[in-house]
Amino acid sequence: MAVTACQGLGFVVSLIGIAGIIAATCMDQWSTQDLYNNPVTAVFNYQGLWRSCVRESSGFTECRGYFTLLGLPAMLQAVRALMIVGIVLGAIGLLVSIFALKCIRIGSMEDSAKANMTLTSGIMFIVSGLCAIAGVSVFANMLVTNFWMSTANMYTGMGGMVQTVQTRYTFGAALFVGWVAGGLTLIGGVMMCIACRGLAPEETNYKAVSYHASGHSVAYKPGGFKASTGFGSNTKNKKIYDGGARTEDEVQSYPSKHDYV
């Protein structure tokens, strides 16, 4: 039950995260005009990954797309790439995780297959979240660098008399949406990976009881039946090793005071 809840919650958190990454990528407010300590302008500039916009105090808003590909800064291209990779991985992860959900029955899909799919989607969500966080952080770093550069020469004097105000840009809403969304996707991915551990039917090489005896001895189940190695071979005169951790179904295989003859 806990596994199903963890998986379901991981799916929902990742879904919200990926929706947020998509929203952030499409948003125009990645960088917004810094209004602090600036002359009050009747024009507000803001920029996204795909276009830049100007909102006038009259209410008129005009947005222009970046129609050039080669003319754009390499950093912007890198951020675009990271966000798109994040979205693509996240979308594939969502698709995979839908089929991996324990509450959804698809044919005769085994738990091991669901576990693998859960792990795959979890890893995809983690990478998707990291891509988004990296993309947003790269853009934020670019803004900080440009901000201090433009602050250094906030007013560039022209002929001593005329002044040109340099527009400074600060963090836009999309950055915060991106950080939160990336974090949620990452958390969702981790939850899916945790759920995968609980889903996996933990296979053992030998389902017999391990014990050490001085003479010829045989391991018996309480019903008097000879314990099996899992391969149908005789256990007489052999040291039998447990192949690892057991599932709940194997509990009766543990030695008890009745197991020795």
């Epitope: 002359p39 009747a42 024009v43 500039n45 006038e56 105090s57 009259s58 005329v162 002044q163 040109t164």
Partner: antibody, heavy 118, light 113 residues
């Protein structure tokens, strides 16, 4: 057709108060930034106040800040200018204008005269 | 505050002549975001309120005759009337629409001989 009709202009004593109104029609009033501009007897144009869409922000020049208040009633399609502590230099023709693209004033009313006597 | 300086303060021309008037701002009115200059030109005929002629320094308002042309960028702007008509008798004002407070030039009075 866009129409802006100002009213409320009068002769007032220095230090007095006055409220100007501007009735708007022919456009969606609530979707536009509105302004008051005055023209002095020397024919100089002076921007007095601007209220943006929604009325959340208002802007004034230092010469009237704290004395004049621009407001709007979108339900009545009316723009107001509350003037207090009037001075002789406030004597002017007051125009109400609709702000459009480029923050320019595309539509102006016919104006109302405010005279402040010493 | 931004100071808008217009020159000449008045000019007298004959009908059909080409007229240019200048407007200078104390700070650049060019917005880097959209590469537009927030300067507006108005025409005020006697006994009338001002009428919008040109916005964004060079965009003609609809209904304005194409003999009116705005040009310039940054701090220096010009209004040109290619062939003056008798009905162009008016005072022409330029305005800063970029910085608050919005400021107007003192005007250029155009008179016809």
């Amino acid at each position: 057709e866009v129409q802006l009709v100002e009213s409320g202009g009068a002769l007032v004593k220095s230090g007095g108060s006055l409220r100007l109104s501007c009735a708007a029609s022919g456009f969606t009033f609530s979707n536009n930034a509105m302004s008051w501009i005055r023209q002095t007897p020397e024919k100089r144009l002076e921007w007095v106040a601007t209220i943006i869409i929604g009325g959340t922000y208002t802007y004034y020049p230092d010469s009237v800040k704290g004395r004049f208040t621009i407001s709007r009633d979108n339900a009545k399609n009316t723009l107001y200018l509350q003037m207090s502590s009037l001075r002789s230099e406030d004597t002017a023709f007051y125009y109400c204008a609709r702000q459009v693209y480029g923050n320019s004033f595309a539509y102006w009313g016919q104006g109302t005269l405010v005279s402040v006597s010493a | 505050d931004i100071v808008m300086t217009q020159s000449p303060s008045s000019l007298t021309v004959t009908a059909g002549e080409k007229v240019t008037m200048s407007c200078k701002s104390s700070q650049s009115l060019l917005n880097s975001g959209n590469q537009k200059n927030y300067l507006t030109w108005y025409q005020q005929k006697p006994g009338q309120p001002p009428k919008l002629l040109i916005y964004w320094a060079s965009t003609r308002e609809s209904g304005v005759p194409d003999r009116f042309t705005g040009s310039g960028s940054g701090t220096d702007f010009t209004l040109t009337i290619s062939s003056v008509q008798a009905e162009d008798l008016a005072v022409y004002y330029c305005q800063n629409n970029y910085f608050y407070p919005f400021t107007f030039g003192s005007g250029t009075k155009l008179e016809i001989k």
